[in-house]
Interface confidence: low
């Protein structure tokens, strides 16, 4: 019986000859746990593992710590891959993070971090980022140094308030910080002056809620 081939990320899927965008099954080395992830095989050389996508407001992102841990949503549409998988993956080798953004006027922008990883659950999946380039702002809209992840039932931010409850969604909130890509999805013409929307401050400012976001990772180099 032939050995079952497993892929840890979309870069491995891409290298194996699968060059079509779509949902693939990923498995970490020395693990039987499988996750379904969307692989972007076209953008910037292909092999990107999508860890977050917002596009139409069809999925509720005001979820619990456990749901953000294991992931939720539809990998073909709006979803969160899962903090535990991403943490384990990004601690096995060096990954880059690309965040692709769309506004309601047809503009697109991106932020690329040359090194990205998440700490373990014991350290609240704290985000670590280095080396920002891109068109979505010269300053990182994810607060630096990185913060712990917070959800509606796990308040790990630096605010007097509870950012996840006020701004909605799980995120690496500061107090509350210049971004939240997991905020409320507001349709066009309802997307301005929204404090709890999908925010990337150093591109669109404080009250602008974005039309679409994609967070994707790929091994560095």
């Amino acid at each position: 019986k032939g050995e079952q081939i497993s892929f840890r990320d979309c870069a491995e899927v891409f290298k194996s000859g699968h060059t079509t965008n779509g949902v693939y099954t990923l498995t970490l080395p020395n693990s039987t746990e499988e996750v379904k992830a969307y692989c972007d095989m076209e953008a910037g050389g292909g092999g990107w593992t999508i860890i977050q996508r917002r596009e139409d407001g069809s999925v509720d992102f005001q979820r619990t710590w456990k749901e953000y841990k294991v992931g939720f949503g539809n990998p073909s549409g709006e979803y969160w891959l899962g903090n535990e998988f991403v943490s384990q993956l990004t601690n096995q080798q060096r990954y880059v993070l690309k965040i692709h953004l769309k506004d309601w006027e047809g503009n697109e922008a991106y932020s690329l971090y040359e090194h990205f990883y998440l700490s373990s659950e014991e350290l609240n999946y704290r985000i670590h980022l280095k080396g920002l380039t891109g068109t979505a702002g010269k300053i990182s809209s994810i607060s630096q140094p990185g913060n712990d992840f917070s959800t509606k039932d796990a308040d790990n931010d630096k605010c007097i308030c509870k950012c996840s409850q006020m701004l909605t969604g799980g995120w690496w909130f500061d107090a509350c910080g210049p971004s939240n890509l997991n905020g409320m999805y507001y349709p066009q013409r309802q997307n301005t002056n929204k404090f709890n929307g999908i925010k990337w401050y150093y591109w669109k400012g404080s009250g602008y809620s974005l039309k679409g976001t994609t967070m994707m990772i790929r091994p560095a180099g």
Partner: antibody, heavy 129, light 109 residues
Framework: QVQLVQSGAEVKKPGASVKVSCKAS????????MHWVRQAPGQGLEWMGW????????NYAQKFQGRVTMTRDTSISTAYMELSRLRSDDTAVYYC??????????????????????WGQGTMVTVSS | SYVLTQPPSVSVAPGQTARITCGGN??????VHWYQQKPGQAPVLVVY???DRPSGIPERFSGSNSGNTATLTISRVEAGDEADYYC???????????FGGGTKLTVLS
Amino acid sequence: QVQLVQSGAEVKKPGASVKVSCKASGYNFAGYYMHWVRQAPGQGLEWMGWINPNSGGTNYAQKFQGRVTMTRDTSISTAYMELSRLRSDDTAVYYCARSPNPYYYSSPGYYYPAAFDIWGQGTMVTVSS
Amino acid sequence: SYVLTQPPSVSVAPGQTARITCGGNNIGSKSVHWYQQKPGQAPVLVVYDTSDRPSGIPERFSGSNSGNTATLTISRVEAGDEADYYCQVWDSSSDHWVFGGGTKLTVLS
């Protein structure tokens, strides 16, 4: 200019209640938390809690839970602190103080729990039988 | 709950440097604010976010923070600096503000 003006001194009997007011002027009242801090004679500062004038939400120090009520009237930019079941050890100067609301000013929404940048002049409350 | 420890008093001659400490478990990871209070007056913010000064506060006032100790430093001390000084931090585990017990700064004549 920016200022907080508090109501005058009060003398109360044990078991009574006291309500101290704090009128804000010179800034956007809704954009700042209002804190209450007290100081017993010869003692240090003691934080009692805050109210978010924008939402009316409150956060009281454990020690005062059940005895303190913080309210506000946004139409006249005034915050209130009511302390009930007064005891002699509640004799103190009560201060209101503001701090920027880290949620309201979300441009870029990047505020640490902010310091108390403006204080009222204080209200002396004496509890004596 | 989180506890901040300050020395009750610090004495210094005019023109010298005064250092007032504020001890707390891993306080180095927190943002520390410092207030000056003169007799019969309300407190005044002199240093916020560990080392920043509000407008109108002289450069002689500075702050630092590392490990388990935050420090307010007043250089070239003047008679008018005589006051009580309080440190303050936000304790995110209890969602409460905490003040130190205060330090009386005496400027020797």
